[in-house]
């Protein structure tokens, strides 16, 4: 049954909101989709989770959530926020998850984010952010996940990322980024997942991915690349690579020489005509390889060291004979 404490907790539930104990003598408060235009005033100090998403909140006053020192997750997605003032999250010492997606923010709320030392996950996707100030994440030493997709960024906010050495996953997809400069992610040594799909990327610095020593997933799909992304060669832990739906015409010799852990490569919907014979060597984890319409391939690819392929598709090539060793190379 419920303890006396949970009864006290539930008496601190704002009108029309749904509240329940979180199992740790703290309160989960759901005030989503209620047409609220301002924050509820009578929140329990013991609130650990507060969902205010899908309302009509257009502004936050400084210090709108006083003394919610136990609050770990705050959802403000799907409101009409255009600006978040300094002090909006003052006192939220335990805050780990902050969701601000689907608002109308034009800038990262730098001052409001300062000193959120416990923050692990920050969603800023689906806003109108065109500029990320250099020091905007400088106090977020615990940040693990950052969403900046579906905004109006035209370049990688290189300096802003320098302080995020604990970051593990980031998406910059669905922006208007056109170039990735050398060392764009140079300090993100813990990053495992990076999504850059659906941008306008047409060029990559030769060393643009240097420093991403933990990266396992890289998504460059739906961009304007017209050359193979040789910058991936420093990504020794890369497992999943996507660069489909670009304008890449050739895959060079030794294309994946620095990526021996690759399991999946998606590169369909590119006008690939030429593939270096050694391009797919020494990829022992690779399971599927599909090469459609590569009209300039005249020799069967050398699959030395790529011994675990389960599916190989070659269409539209000019291969006239198969090497005798092909059946030895494949399982």
């Amino acid at each position: 049954g419920s303890s006396p404490r949970s009864g006290v907790l539930l008496r601190g539930c704002p009108t029309h909101c749904h509240c329940e104990p979180d199992g740790r003598m703290l309160l989960r408060v759901d005030c989503s989709d209620l047409g609220l235009s301002e924050l509820p005033s009578n929140l329990s100090v013991f609130t650990s989770y507060l969902d205010l998403s899908m309302n009509n909140i257009s502004q936050l006053l400084p210090n709108p959530l006083p003394s919610l020192r136990f609050l770990e997750e705050l959802r403000l997605a799907g409101n009409a926020l255009t600006y978040i003032p300094k002090g909006a999250f003052t006192g939220l010492y335990s805050l780990k998850v902050l969701m601000l997606q689907n608002n109308q923010l034009r800038h990262v709320p730098t001052e409001a984010l300062q000193n959120l030392r416990s923050l692990q996950s920050l969603r800023l996707d689906a806003n109108h952010i065109s500029y990320v100030p250099p020091s905007c994440f400088s106090g977020l030493h615990s940040l693990r996940h950052l969403w900046l997709d579906d905004n109006a960024l035209t370049e990688i906010p290189v300096q802003a990322f320098r302080s995020l050495s604990a970051l593990q996953a980031m998406t910059l997809a669905l922006n208007k980024i056109h170039h990735i400069p050398d060392y764009a992610f140079g300090n993100l040594s813990s990053l495992v997942v990076l999504h850059l799909h659906n941008n306008r990327i047409h060029s990559l610095g030769k060393k643009c991915f240097d420093g991403l020593h933990s990266l396992e997933t890289l998504d460059l799909n739906y961009n304007n690349l017209d050359e193979f992304p040789t910058a991936i060669r420093t990504l020794s832990n890369l497992k999943e690579l996507g660069f489909h739906s670009n304008n890449i015409r050739s895959i060079p010799e030794k294309a994946f020489v620095g990526n021996p852990s690759l399991i999946t490569i998606h590169f369909y919907d590119n006008p690939i005509q030429f593939v270096g014979r050694s391009a797919f060597q020494h990829l022992p984890e690779l399971r599927t390889l599909t090469l459609n319409g590569a009209s300039q391939i005249t020799e069967f690819p050398d699959l030395t060291g790529t011994a675990n392929l389960e599916s190989l598709t070659l269409t539209g090539a000019q291969i006239s004979s198969l090497p005798q060793t092909v059946c030895n190379q494949l399982p």
């Epitope: 140079g186 420093t234 030794k254």
Partner: antibody, heavy 118, light 111 residues
Amino acid sequence: EVQLVQSGAEVKKPGASVKVSCKASGYTFSAYWIEWVRQAPGQGLEWIGEILPGSDSTDYNEKFKVRATFTSDTSTSTVYLELSSLRSEDTAVYYCARGGHYGSLDYWGQGTLVTVSS
Amino acid sequence: DIVMTQSPDSLAVSLGERATINCRASESVDNYGNSFMHWYQQKPGQPPKLLIYLASNLESGVPDRFSGSGSRTDFTLTISSLQAEDVAVYYCQQNYEDPFTFGQGTKVEIK
């Protein structure tokens, strides 16, 4: 522990070639660029170029483009610098170094003295 | 090529006093807010050792009496309180563009 260990000193005649090796250990060999830098006796440091081990990615200082060649052997985690058509002004200590944080040279080999003398 | 010019060429400082070395690049070495300028220390018979990367970031294991500052074309390496073991030649280096270039070096001695 990251280490770069270079081959021993060489004495060469003008017009000859020299091949200096740099064996890396303690990190993922193919994930970092190796830079080559030289230092003439009593002089400053001069960048020769760089190679990403295992790949064909190289960059040469225009001054050395014709005479310098970088190669690598991933099976032994070794990078090589070959310098041809040696002249007396090539007498120098040749260093390999790892391109670390933002391309800064965070680990260096002990250096290889190449003396060119007739 | 970007020319790196250090000043002074040599510097004599009393133990415990501040030593300041300047480095000027012939053109800006800044890109996307990062200054691609690094500082090295070289003692006789040894390879150079990285002290500071990206103009102001202290390399791991380097004493915090060393600091770097500056942007674009003008940079400074400061040793806040000179120790005997700091006697060496100090070099700045840019890797903003090929060919990467070094300053001519500044020799630091004890007065």
